[in-house]
Interface confidence: low
């Protein structure tokens, strides 16, 4: 299958979704976001060994060329394949507003 | 601007489009592709320093958390923002066929 799901490095070490707890201060948002005070940021972390969750043909090419020219071509990288929306309560001049961000939390991951 | 385009590492060192010349053998395609014999593979290579070509909010978060927790959270990664199509002449049981691949050659790059 194009999108191999077996991680040769051991479980949890290849590209997958991780949760990182972050405060508004960590994110540099304290001056413009009221809530939530803490965000469970889902992000894509892990190695992308040969053909693991290859997103597309480009990722497969990258794997082949990285094997041949590791100093020139980097290995594929673990990035979001899609996102979950998140609502932030923001400070405004007149009070507060609710804003939905569609590109904030990773939903699932692939290698590209 | 959210997507800063100034590379603090020096010209050409940050995330951008590069061309890598590759033969069918390099790509492992010699058994199923007839033409072209050589591909000018456009791919995204380079560093993603703070806010450089940040693709979205997620990339900005990643930058912030990488600064705080560099061992846990990787820096954003240079990946294709879009692709150029490419036509391959493929071998088939009955002869040859033309197949267009939409996800083969990077067109432009961003950090995510």
């Amino acid at each position: 299958a194009r999108n191999g799901d077996h991680c040769p490095l051991g479980p949890g070490r290849c590209c997958r979704l991780h949760t990182v707890r972050a405060s508004l201060e960590d994110l540099g948002w304290a001056d413009w976001v009221l809530s939530p005070r803490e965000v469970q940021v889902t992000m894509c972390i892990g190695a992308c060994p040969s053909q693991f969750r290859a997103a597309n043909m480009h990722a497969q090419i990258k794997t082949s060329l990285h094997r041949l020219k590791p100093d020139t071509v980097p290995a594929p990288c673990c990035v979001p394949a899609s996102y979950n929306p998140m609502v932030l309560i923001q400070k405004t001049d007149t009070g507060v507003s609710l804003q939905t961000y569609d590109d904030l939390l990773a939903k699932d991951c692939h290698c590209i | 601007a959210r997507n800063g385009d100034h590379c603090p590492l020096g010209p050409g060192r940050c995330c951008r489009l590069h061309t890598v010349r590759a033969s069918l053998e390099d790509l492992g395609w010699a058994d199923w592709v007839l033409s072209p014999r050589e591909v000018q593979v456009t791919m995204c290579i380079g560093a993603c320093p703070s806010q450089f070509r940040a693709a979205n909010m997620h990339a900005q978060i990643k930058t912030s958390l990488h600064r705080l927790k560099p061992d846990t959270v990787p820096a954003p990664c240079c990946v294709p923002a879009s692709y150029n199509p490419m036509v391959l002449i493929q071998k088939t049981d009955t002869g040859v066929s033309l197949q267009t691949y939409d996800d083969l050659l990077a067109k432009d790059c961003h950090c995510i």
Epitope: R2, D5, G10, P11, G12, H18, I45, A81, K107 | -
Partner: antibody, heavy 119, light 107 residues
Framework: EVQLVQSGAEVKKPGASVKVSCKAS????????LNWVRQATGQGLEWMGD????????IYNQKFKGRVTMTVDTSISTAYMELSSLRSEDTAVYYC????????????WGQGTLVTVSS | DIQMTQSPSSLSASVGDRVTITCKAS??????LAWYQQKPGKAPKLLIY???SLETGVPSRFSGSGSGTDYTFTISSLQPEDIATYYC?????????FGGGTKVEIK
């Protein structure tokens, strides 16, 4: 032989918390992710989240976000799932399940822990 | 979240019959599908993973097929001990989700 042994049944009042344990044996504990799945009486299966004992990476089902906490004690090969602010609809059998080597299918399951929430 | 729609919700068949259960995902899950058997009062038991791979020790009368969004689970010759509820589960994208289950009974 792989075994996952869970703690015993619990009866809790609404608003309380429950902590279920899952002791693993028969394999290298840090080599496999552990998941928690629940099943209300006569209902289907619902995934709550998973925990990587190697690096303590956790993915929670957003449905339970803020109410569920998954932890691990690698020294005794035991995983824990704590659910807070219990309500009657949390009455269910809670299972721990070991993830497969190549993906999040569940190849070994605990015997289940019945949690009853009743006033 | 990826929704898994399993059908039928129940079926009745005779010993020796071929039994087929289908599972439809709300988006492509790239073969990341498992099938489980659950008997009353017991934990689920893994039968199939990767849409088609038979778990070690599972009888060969159980099989799986499919791709994209559509998957099928088959018992080639129903046996009395196969009476149970069967669930599909996707593990392409968290939250990992299960189908609603199919209760298999003997006629």
């Amino acid at each position: 032989e792989v075994q996952l042994v869970q703690s015993g049944a619990e009866v809790k009042k609404p608003g309380a918390s429950v902590k279920v344990s899952c002791k693993a044996s028969g394999y290298t504990f840090t080599d496999y992710n552990l998941n928690w799945v629940r099943q209300a009486t006569g209902q289907g299966l619902e995934w709550m989240g998973d925990l990587n004992p190697y690096n303590q990476g956790i993915i929670y089902n957003q449905k339970f976000k803020g109410r569920v906490t998954m932890t691990v004690d690698t020294s005794i090969s035991t995983a824990y799932m704590e659910l807070s602010s219990l309500r009657s609809e949390d009455t269910a059998v809670y299972y721990c399940a070991r993830e497969g080597r190549g993906g999040a299918w569940f190849d070994s399951w605990g015997q289940g822990t019945l949690v009853t929430v009743s006033s | 979240d990826i929704q898994m729609t399993q059908s039928p919700s129940s079926l009745s068949a005779s010993v020796g019959d071929r039994v087929t259960i289908t599972c439809k995902a709300s988006e492509d899950i790239y073969h990341r599908l498992a099938w489980y058997q659950q008997k009353p009062g017991k934990a689920p038991k893994l039968l199939i993973y990767g849409a088609t791979s038979l778990e070690t020790g599972v009888p060969s009368r159980f099989s799986g097929s499919g791709s994209g969004t559509d998957y099928t689970f088959t018992i080639s010759s129903l046996q009395p001990e196969d009476i149970a509820t069967y669930y599909c589960q996707q593990y392409w994208s968290p939250p990992f989700t299960f189908g609603g289950g199919t209760k298999v009974e003997i006629k």
